[in-house]
């Protein structure tokens, strides 16, 4: 019966005297007065079986001890680890000249597992074993014992098994543990290829070439090979396997991507979380499905988020000048998650009596810089008819607009050509500046050209450079602009509107908000 002891994964134990429960029962010659089996207590106060001999008073000792038959199990080279303790001859009184401090290790290959006698002539010598200078001190019961460990190897072996023998020539020695093992390169997975348990070669420099097989749910990229070295270590991995689409490497295996993850190709990448606005409902997904209302453009990679058409442009402003119109607007609040936003202009000519009866403007109208695919947020429309109502629609479009076009993506304005708009406002003043607000006032335009219906104030942070502006409308010639940021420079423009349309914006007024309240009376110049 053997107890379990833990050894390195690359060693396969054929014999371990420490694991045997009860007597070892090896064969000694002579039967009496030579090697003797003795129980000692180990560090856990458990009895262990050892063999000892201490015939140090007489010269010419020749005491043999032979193990039982040891199966080879296909190994061509085996290793013998001997843990022993040797008593110094000078610690024994009156034995100088007869006491030795070495013993000899022998082996004999045999197919017969029941040889009863020791025939010394059959055995081949492996080595003479001496106590090393370096030894381990171990607790045996309550004692500290100097334990030497020596390892020898023998091979190539060819028969079914073998016997080991220990020859004592007059030492005071105890064999505390004898372990016989061979080395293998243990089953392993490298680069997603599995390599089987492989017994090492016959000599200490041999390398055994082993071809690996791809693990489940993977495919060969290059033929996987490794070499099993004599010490039981795998060497020089060549080639590899890659996890299939929908699978990723985890602890040397290809695991299906979890729900909510995907992998599009056979690569060494991990599964990725489904991009925003998409999902997978099965394990092992190779792509993710877009959420309702979200889409992928034809040239979008599987790794890109699903996106949607943009919302309508904001703050559309028109400026009519006889038969020309300048339109200006802000980017949509929601770009749909895409960068490829552009704008299309739709021009409709409408009847004066019934504005709902509108027709396309036709090709006589010109657009600067262009009508469709605008990247800027302004356009000039020329060559319009005089005294005509026009409706202009500005459509925000992106790469997925075609999958779900909707009126929600446009903003429109209706204008009448050939009516004079008011002139620009000459003087804008900042009456009061606080941390969070600016009080503005201005004069009526020199040429109102009719009844002024309202004023429009456009403002933006100076460093935003008109990229993101806000509009405030008022019937009065003053207004409080609130919700500003402290210590920030703002630029303000004001224009008037009559039934004919908007006039031009005033010159810019630049104002910096305060940290403490103060009254600043503007004089038309920049106020800071």
């Amino acid at each position: 019966v053997t107890g379990s002891r833990v050894y390195p994964a690359n060693e396969v134990t054929l014999l371990d005297s420490r694991s045997v429960q009860g007597e070892l029962g090896w064969i000694a010659s002579p039967l009496e007065g030579g090697w003797e089996e003795v129980s000692i207590m180990d560090e856990k106060n458990t009895p262990i079986r050892t063999y000892q001999v201490c015939n140090v008073m007489e010269a010419s000792q020749n005491n043999w001890l032979r193990t039982d038959w040891i199966t080879r199990e296909g190994a061509q080279r085996v290793y013998i680890e001997i843990k022993f303790t040797l008593r110094d001859c000078n610690s024994l009184p009156g034995v100088m000249g007869t006491c030795k401090e070495t013993f000899n290790l022998y082996y004999y290959e045999s197919d017969n597992d029941k040889e009863r006698f020791i025939r010394e002539s059959q055995f081949g010598k492996i080595d003479t074993i001496a106590a090393d200078e370096s030894f381990t001190q171990v607790d045996i019961g309550d004692r500290i014992m100097k334990l030497n460990t020596e390892i020898r190897d023998v091979g190539p072996l060819s028969k079914k098994g073998f016997y080991l023998a220990f020859q004592d020539v007059g030492a005071c020695i105890a064999l505390v543990s004898v372990r016989v093992f061979y080395k293998k390169c243990p089953l392993t997975v490298r680069n997603l290829a599995q390599f089987p348990d492989t017994i090492t070669g016959a000599d200490t420099s041999s390398l055994v070439e082993v071809r690996g097989s791809c693990v489940n749910n993977s495919e060969e990229k290059d033929v996987p090979k490794m070499y099993c070295g004599a010490d039981g270590e795998w060497l020089v991995p060549i080639g590899n396997c890659l996890c299939n689409a929908g699978h990723e490497e985890q602890n040397g295996e290809c695991q299906a991507c979890k729900i909510g993850y995907y992998k599009a190709l056979s690569t060494d990448a991990s599964c990725a979380k489904c991009p925003p606005h998409s999902y997978s409902v099965w394990e092992g997904a190779t792509s993710c499905t877009c959420d309702r209302g979200f889409f992928r453009a034809d040239n979008d990679a599987a790794s890109m988020p699903c996106t949607r058409p943009p919302s309508a442009p904001l703050n559309l402003i028109s400026n009519v000048n006889e038969t020309s119109v300048n339109l200006e607007w802000s980017s949509p609040q929601n770009t749909g998650g895409r960068q490829d936003i552009s704008y299309n202009v739709v021009c409709k000519k409408c009847g004066a009596g019934d504005p709902s009866k509108c027709r396309p403007c036709g090709s006589g109208v010109h657009y600067t810089p262009q009508q469709n695919g605008l990247k800027t947020t302004r356009v000039s429309i020329t060559d319009l008819l005089a005294h005509t109502n026009y409706t202009f629609e500005i459509w925000a479009v992106n790469g997925v607009s075609k999958y779900n076009p909707s009126p929600d993506q446009s903003v429109s304005v209706t204008v009448t050509t050939n009516q004079a708009a008011p002139s620009s406002i000459a003087l804008v003043q900042a009456k009061e500046v606080t941390r969070y607000s600016v009080a503005l006032a201005w004069l009526e335009p020199d040429r109102p050209n009719g009844v002024i219906l309202e004023y429009e104030v456009k403002y933006y942070e100076k460093d935003q450079n008109e990229r993101s502006y806000r509009i405030v409308r008022t019937a009065a010639r003053n207004t409080d602009i609130k919700g500003l940021n402290p210590l920030t420079s703002y630029v303000f423009h004001v224009r008037a509107r009559t039934a004919a349309g908007y006039g031009d914006f005033s010159e810019p007024l630049e104002v910096t908000t305060n940290t403490v309240p103060s009254r600043i009376i503007g004089d038309g110049a920049n106020s800071t």
Partner: antibody, heavy 121, light 106 residues
Framework: QVQLLQSGAEVKKPGASVKVPCKAS????????MSWVRQAPGQGLEWMGW????????TYAQGFTGRFVFSLDTSVSTAYLQISSLKAEDTAVYYC??????????????WGQGTLVTVSS | EIVLTQSPATLSVSPGERATLSCRAS??????LAWYQQKPGQAPRLLIY???TWATGIPDRFSASGSGTDFTLTISRVEPEDFAVYYC????????FGQGTKVEIK
């Protein structure tokens, strides 16, 4: 089997000598040292010393020098204890015991049956 | 000379009980200590050497431990044949015995 055979009881007068034999059998006599132990009536054990059976070299314990001599006759595998100038306090059982050296320690593993020496006028 | 002191002088136990005997050295003897059993009218018998190693044929109900100056012999379950006198003995340059502990039937 291994055994040590000692002679029967001896009665001696004070001032006399006695030679106690110890015959070994069942093992190679010269391969193990021989020790001598005394036990006075009703008392404990007292180690007297030992002799190297290979070289004949004796070692005596404190208090057992002078009148006590260890000797050998290897041809008949026998060790001897000789006591001269006997005194009444020498009355005791005298044991021979084979000395066992081992890696783990030493001990007297085989004992003779003992020889009672009585010193009385 | 190293003096060995054994205690108790007499130990009364019933068969099947555990017996623990002590031996203390006047100076360290490392693990160089043996235990012997002696029954009336018989020669001593080696039980333990090297402080804790069983001699040949000794049942495993006998066990021993210790090193340096303090040593213990334990009989886990005393059998009728275990009633005897037990001696400890140290072996250094010169050997000495303890005075003995008598284990008797309670």
């Amino acid at each position: 089997q291994v055994q040590l055979l000692q002679s029967g009881a001896e009665v001696k007068k004070p001032g006399a000598s006695v030679k106690v034999p110890c015959k070994a059998s069942g093992y190679t006599f010269t391969s193990r040292a021989m020790s001598w132990v005394r036990q006075a009536p009703g008392q404990g054990l007292e180690w007297m010393g030992w002799i190297n059976t290979n070289t004949g070299n004796p070692t005596y314990a404190q208090g057992f020098t002078g009148r006590f001599v260890f000797s050998l006759d290897t041809s008949v595998s026998t060790a001897y204890l000789q006591i001269s100038s006997l005194k009444a306090e020498d009355t005791a059982v005298y044991y021979c015991a084979r000395v066992r050296f081992t890696v783990y320690g030493d001990g007297m593993d085989v004992w003779g049956q003992g020889t009672l020496v009585t010193v009385s006028s | 000379e190293i003096v060995l002191t054994q205690s108790p002088a007499t130990l009364s136990v019933s068969p099947g009980e555990r017996a623990t005997l002590s031996c203390r050295a006047s100076q360290s003897v490392s693990s160089n200590l043996a235990w012997y059993q002696q029954k009336p009218g018989q020669a001593p018998r080696l039980l333990i050497y090297g402080a804790s190693t069983w001699a040949t044929g000794i049942p495993d109900r006998f066990s021993a431990s210790g090193s340096g100056t303090d040593f213990t012999l334990t009989i886990s379950r005393v059998e009728p044949e275990d009633f005897a006198v037990y001696y400890c003995q140290q072996y250094g340059p010169s050997w000495t015995f303890g005075q003995g502990t008598k284990v008797e039937i309670k």
